[in-house]
């Protein structure tokens, strides 16, 4: 019984053409939605001419949905097993579930003045950039729509810029009508263990962000895993959101819709300093804002943002350090709402349920060049925002599955 | 160590155009900005504009804006400074020199308009 | 636009004297001021730069003090070959903009 369970198994989460698990690859069956809570900063003013604080408020949620549209160009390679794919990137608002509009207003770090002054750290240039800075009439925070927040706008102080420079700033842009990919994955045709392991993305086995080991694309995309995951397994994983490979460990049974699944989540040490997790060592890339490597909980990622200082953290700063969160009023981070799991069917690895949980940051630093900087004393790291993207199997899907698979086994 | 080696001496008809240049050595060009100042004589320092070698990025003084442009050649680490419609008052010494604060001087190219 | 008014424009000593040249700004610059000597054919030459720095090499009777928008160069103990044009340039903000300059004199 168990052995032909086992085959029917193997046999159905092979991702090629006629397999359950490939029609559920190929475009998911489940609805996933992406919900922001906008960081609106309160005391504007204060920030920019006292260095005081930055006083948050969280706004939300807007959701959108997400993930629905299927994967292109897929396309089989037979000779080494793998199939390769873009996932296209798309998202709807969803008024009914959003605490608002996509024209409603917040009061944001401004992203071109923060990612402008730290690109450019020769000081000429940066006399340059405040001229044209108050020719626009520009500041530390800027007042925008959740659209322009998130999927963009034409900024006025890069309108000036005198040479090309893009123009349009906002956290996710480009994002409709774009790709992420190419990915290339196993298709466990010869090897069941290795199916929906990333071979290689955009074309490399490496990321060319890190140093070292933290460099290595791991795993899956975190959708599926290789069959028969045992509690004690760490599942390795790859996120482009996070320009990363991450991994997480086993926390508790859950029973979901009746189909009983281990409950992964993302461990505080995947957060950690370099102090407490050595491993982490190549993921501290620079010495003066980590403080030499010492702070913990925030990721650098600008080497895969064109150098825009973009750091990414669990949302409220969850398990990162508390020099980190000092400068910043009004975050509660806790562990249920803000952390990252994944509920995994451990005999099919399927992801049935998941939450990703992730908060997008930016560094300013002061600047005596730059007028609206000029007055600070200290960096800061500053919440833009946070995400909480989420999906669970269908009630119908559940049913089928619960037929099909965890049925036939018990 | 560093030097700033401009271009000789030059005299030009009114309306025409002077291209002076400056060659760096002793140190990475694109590394600091490239300033020129020009002295009429007897006169004070005036600022005319700067170029960042790096990133392009380039400052003129508004009194030259529109005649004036400046160039960098990163490959013979060489700033160049044109002023276009030229006329008498343009007579001047004419120095590229290093960085914001000016650490290092070319010795200065004499442009002289005259009919 | 910066300007910066420069003042005595002509000054006179004797080699022992101290001599200020004054310097005030229409903006707060902090300390982005420099101070540069020049000597007749030749190009002008960096004593203290932004900070009140002394460059490397200037003789230690130079000095400069000053923030925001009035600023002092001080010569203590003038000698002989001191006998030069003196300016100040503001570094804080663009366009960059000088002094008119300061005529020092040794009897």
């Known amino acids: 019984g168990d052995l032909l369970i086992q085959k029917t198994i193997k046999k159905q989460v092979v991702l090629e053409e006629g397999t359950i698990a490939f029609k559920n690859w190929v475009k998911t069956g489940t609805e996933v939605y992406r919900q922001f809570w906008i960081f609106d900063v309160q005391n504007p003013q204060e920030v920019m001419m006292n260095s005081s604080n930055i006083q948050v408020k969280q706004r939300g949620p807007y959701t959108y949905r997400v993930r629905f549209l299927a994967k292109e160009n897929v396309t089989q390679d037979a000779e080494d097993n793998t199939v390769s794919f873009l996932q296209p990137n798309g998202a709807i608002f969803e008024p009914s579930l959003s605490v608002g509009t996509e024209a409603d207003n917040f009061t944001v770090l401004n992203l071109a003045v923060a990612a402008a002054s730290h690109i450019y750290q020769n000081q000429f240039v940066q006399m340059i950039l405040n001229s044209l800075i108050n020719k626009s009439k520009s500041s530390m925070f800027q007042v925008r729509t959740l659209r322009e927040l998130l999927w963009g706008y034409r900024d006025p102080f890069l309108s000036l810029v005198p040479y090309p420079v893009t123009t349009t700033v906002g956290l996710f842009y480009p994002y409709n009508n774009t790709a992420d990919g190419v990915y290339k994955v196993f298709n466990g045709k010869d090897n069941i263990s290795k199916v929906a392991i990333i071979d290689t993305y955009k074309g490399k086995r490496n990321l060319s962000y890190w140093e070292s080991h933290c460099d290595m694309i791991n795993g899956t995309d975190a959708a599926s895993f290789p069959p028969f995951v045992e509690k004690s397994q760490v599942l390795q994983f790859f996120s482009s959101d996070i320009c990363r490979s991450i991994y997480a460990v086993f926390e508790s049974d859950v029973n979901l819709k009746g189909i009983p699944v281990y409950r992964f989540v993302l461990p505080s040490k995947a957060f950690a300093s370099p102090v407490e997790n050595p491993d982490n060592y190549c993921f501290c890339t620079e010495k003066i804002i980590s403080k030499n490597c010492t702070s913990y909980g925030v990721l650098d990622i600008s080497k895969c943002k064109e150098g825009r200082p973009v750091y990414i953290s669990l949302p409220h700063f969850l398990y990162a350090s508390p020099d980190v969160s000092e400068p910043i009023d009004g975050l509660n981070p806790n562990e249920e709402e803000h952390r990252t799991y994944l509920d995994i069917e451990p005999i099919t690895g399927f992801t049935l349920q998941f939450a990703k949980r992730l908060q997008v940051n930016l560094l300013v630093k002061p600047s005596e060049k730059i007028q609206v900087l000029k007055n600070l004393k200290r960096n800061y790291i500053v919440p833009i925002l946070w995400l909480n993207e989420t999906g669970t199997i269908g009630d119908e899907k559940a049913n089928m599955f619960r037929s099909q698979v965890t049925g036939k086994i018990n | 160590q560093v030097q700033l080696v401009q271009s000789g001496a030059e005299v030009k008809k009114p309306g025409s155009s002077v291209k002076v240049s400056c060659k760096a050595s002793?140190?990475?060009?694109?590394?600091?900005?490239m300033q020129w100042v020009r002295q009429a004589p007897g006169q004070g320092l005036e600022w005319m504009g700067g170029?960042?070698?790096?990133?392009?990025?380039?400052a003129y003084a508004q009194k030259f804006q529109g005649r004036v442009t400046l160039t960098a050649d990163k490959s013979t680490s060489t700033a160049y400074m044109e002023l276009s419609s030229l006329r008498s008052e343009d007579t001047a010494v004419y120095y590229c020199?290093?960085?914001?604060?000016?650490?290092?001087w070319g010795q200065g190219t004499l442009v002289t308009v005259s009919s | 636009e910066t300007t910066v008014t420069q003042s005595p424009a002509f000054m006179s000593a004797t080699p022992g004297d101290k001599v200020t040249i004054s310097c005030i700004t229409s903006?707060?610059?902090?300390?982005?001021m420099n101070w540069y000597q020049q000597k007749p054919g030749e190009p002008p030459k960096l004593l203290i730069s932004?900070?009140?720095t002394l460059r490397p090499g200037v003789p230690s009777r130079f000095s400069s003090s000053g923030y925001g928008t009035d600023f002092t160069f001080t010569i203590n103990n003038i000698e002989s070959e001191d006998a030069a044009y003196y300016y100040c340039?503001?570094?804080?903000?663009?366009?960059?903009?000088f002094g008119q300059g300061t005529k020092l004199e040794i009897k």
């Open positions: 020199t290093r960085k914001l604060d000016f650490d290092y």
């Open positions: 002793g140190y990475r060009f694109s590394d600091y900005e």
């Open positions: 170029i960042d070698p790096e990133t392009g990025g380039i």
């Open positions: 903006t707060d610059i902090d300390d982005d």
């Open positions: 932004e900070g009140n």
């Open positions: 340039l503001q570094s804080d903000n663009l366009p960059l903009t």
